[in-house]
Interface confidence: low
């Protein structure tokens, strides 16, 4: 069956060393247990983090990524899932997409991640 | 089946504080976004303020900024709204609502708590 | 802020009648719209989501459709204990997250 995949639709913004969180789903919400899941940087096309199979496939992730990344898939008998990226660093700024497949079927949704430095200030003077 | 109870409503004169409460269960909660979202007597619905699962984002209507603040704790799974500078325009019925997994819907709503703003 | 508006604002109906419900929206929302019932004394339900989709155990006679900034809620043969409030919901430009006024659908 056909779905479409909506991601957050607003620019999700963390600061440096905190967490970030990439909520993604698909429309209608169904079971995506045995899908493919996924996200990768655009435009780069480097793998941020891959389920398939019901297992997340570290060895797929981009070594940049790699240990700093969870999948939060407690509802994702209903089609919603999050990407979770810890100690959030500059390089990890800019466009995302994330990816539903079933089979031959995919789609797939774009998100920014915008990343604040916490100790940023003006200077008055 | 999913359950959210609200409590800590009641009477206050402006300028009063209130902190209110909800207990989840039913549901992993650290895997949901929580919202309030009140009603005015006999009016419609507003959105007051929300959190992420990791308490890192929290947004505030424009009407409550600077007066209230959002906060929960995983452990307890609980959500709370501290209400301050209370004013008569605040007096709802306070639901605690939970996110239809990040999309920003409502799925589930306690049955709210009364809070009156009155001299 | 995005306003949403509900028309009418009062529907009289009869039980096994059709339910014709609008929401408009100020500026367009594609379709990021919400639809919630509420009945006297209790909280709202929702119904519908991303204006087309039945939530979960929502009766097949609720049916939502439109995009941009103009939606619509059917009840398709109205039940009496679908007489109630409705809201509309955004959840485009956020936040905040508004709703419309509510239409209140009633027993003719």
């Known amino acids: 069956g056909q779905f479409r995949v909506i991601g957050p639709g607003y620019p999700i913004r963390a600061l440096v060393g905190d967490e970030a969180e990439l909520p993604c789903r698909i429309s209608p919400g169904k079971n995506a247990t045995g899908m493919e899941v996924g996200w990768y940087r655009s435009p780069f096309s480097r793998v941020v983090h891959l389920y398939r199979n019901g297992k997340d496939q570290d060895a797929e992730q981009a070594p940049e990524y790699r240990g700093r990344t969870e999948l939060l898939k407690e509802t994702i008998s209903e089609g919603k899932v999050t990407l979770r990226i810890q100690n959030v660093r500059f390089s990890d700024e800019g466009g995302y997409t994330c990816f539903f497949r079933d089979h031959s079927y995919q789609e797939e949704a774009a998100m920014e991640l915008k990343v604040e430095d916490p100790f940023y200030w003006v200077n008055p003077g | 089946q999913v359950q959210l109870v609200e409590s800590g409503g009641g009477l206050v004169k402006p300028g009063g504080s209130l902190r209110l409460s909800c207990a989840a269960s039913g549901f992993t909660f650290s895997s949901y976004s929580m919202h309030w979202v009140r009603q005015a007597p006999g009016k419609g619905l507003e959105w007051v303020s929300d959190?992420?699962?990791?308490?890192?984002?929290?947004n505030y209507a424009d009407s409550v900024k600077g007066r209230f603040t959002i906060s929960r704790d995983n452990a307890k799974n609980s959500v709370y709204l501290q209400m301050h500078s209370l004013r008569d325009e605040d007096t709802a019925v306070y639901y605690c609502?939970?996110?239809?997994?990040?999309?920003?819907?409502?799925?589930?709503w306690g049955q709210g708590t009364l809070v009156t703003v009155s001299s | 802020e995005i306003v949403m508006t509900q028309s009418p604002a009062t529907l009289s109906l009869s039980p096994g009648e059709r339910a014709t419900l609008s929401c408009r929206a100020s500026?367009?929302?594609?379709?990021?719209l919400a639809w919630y019932q509420q009945k006297p004394g209790q909280a709202p339900r929702l119904l519908i989501y991303d204006a087309s989709n039945r939530a979960t155990g929502i009766p097949a006679r609720f049916s939502g459709s439109g995009s941009g900034t103009d939606f619509t809620l059917t009840i398709s043969s109205l039940e009496p204990e679908d007489f109630a409030v409705y809201y509309c919901?955004?959840?485009?430009?956020?936040?905040?997250?508004?709703f419309g006024q509510g239409t209140k659908l009633e027993i003719k």
């Open positions: 500026q367009s929302v594609s379709s990021y």
């Open positions: 959190i992420s699962t990791n308490s890192r984002t929290r």
């Open positions: 609502a939970r996110d239809y997994g990040g999309i920003y819907y409502f799925d589930y």
């Open positions: 919901q955004q959840r485009s430009n956020w936040p905040p997250y508004t």
